[in-house]
């Protein structure tokens, strides 16, 4: 998939509760930054079915955001 | 249950205008954001222009930007798409589109709308040289 550009929020609104879990391919985390003061979940689906936006206060976005920062710390 | 039905298309000569309209129902029209999108004969559906729901931030691919708007009729549920200039590349299936989950993605200088969930059955659009 084309590159992010941080110079608006990605996510134009509030987010999906919740995809299915064997549709997900990669899981991307965008923290609050200059450019958009929220963070975003975004969902890349498997067989180039897109994206999507996670609300980030579902549970499943703070079930990822929780396995994502378990990772990288 | 979710409906979004286009309206507006037709002929028009090379730099003609029309505006196209797409009427939503069966869900809370201020919580989802909606695009346009277009397939042209032989080619993939593009994303043309997208209208956020949480601040009403527009956006354009580049092959639009400049001759296309995009507008939002909350009171009545209606997203227009007034388009002018028109170029006989410009003729295609014109779609409209919308999603909570959606996204703009920026790539080679222009904005893609994705993540769209409920989609309409297309008004075509002619543009004749």
């Known amino acids: 998939f084309p590159m992010f550009k941080r110079g608006r929020c990605l996510c134009i609104g509030p987010g999906v509760k919740a995809v299915k879990v064997a549709d997900i391919e990669k899981a991307s985390i965008m923290y609050p930054s200059n450019n958009c003061d929220k963070i975003e979940v975004i969902i890349t689906l498997k067989e180039n079915k897109g994206q999507r936006c996670l609300n980030p206060k579902s549970k499943q976005a703070r079930l990822i955001i929780k396995k994502v920062e378990r990772k990288n710390f | 249950e979710v409906q979004l039905v286009e309206s507006g298309g037709g002929l028009v000569q090379a730099g003609g205008s029309l505006r196209l309209s797409c009427a939503a129902s069966?869900?809370?029209?201020?919580?989802?954001?909606i695009g346009w999108f277009r397939q042209a004969p032989g080619k993939e559906r593009e994303g043309i222009s997208c209208?956020?729901?949480?601040?009403?931030?527009?956006y354009y691919a580049d092959s639009v930007k400049g001759r296309f708007t995009i507008s939002s009729d909350n009171a009545k549920n209606t997203v227009y798409l007034q388009m002018n200039s028109l170029k006989p590349e410009d003729t295609a299936v014109y779609y409209c589109?919308?999603?909570?989950?959606?996204?703009?993605?920026?790539?080679?200088?222009?904005?893609?709308?994705?993540?769209?969930?409920?989609w309409g059955k297309g008004t075509l659009v002619t543009v004749s040289s």
């Open positions: 209208i956020s729901s949480s601040d009403g931030s527009t």
């Open positions: 069966g869900f809370t029209f201020d919580d989802y954001p």
């Open positions: 589109a919308a999603g909570l989950g959606a996204l703009v993605r920026y790539y080679s200088g222009s904005y893609y709308c994705d993540g769209m969930d409920y």
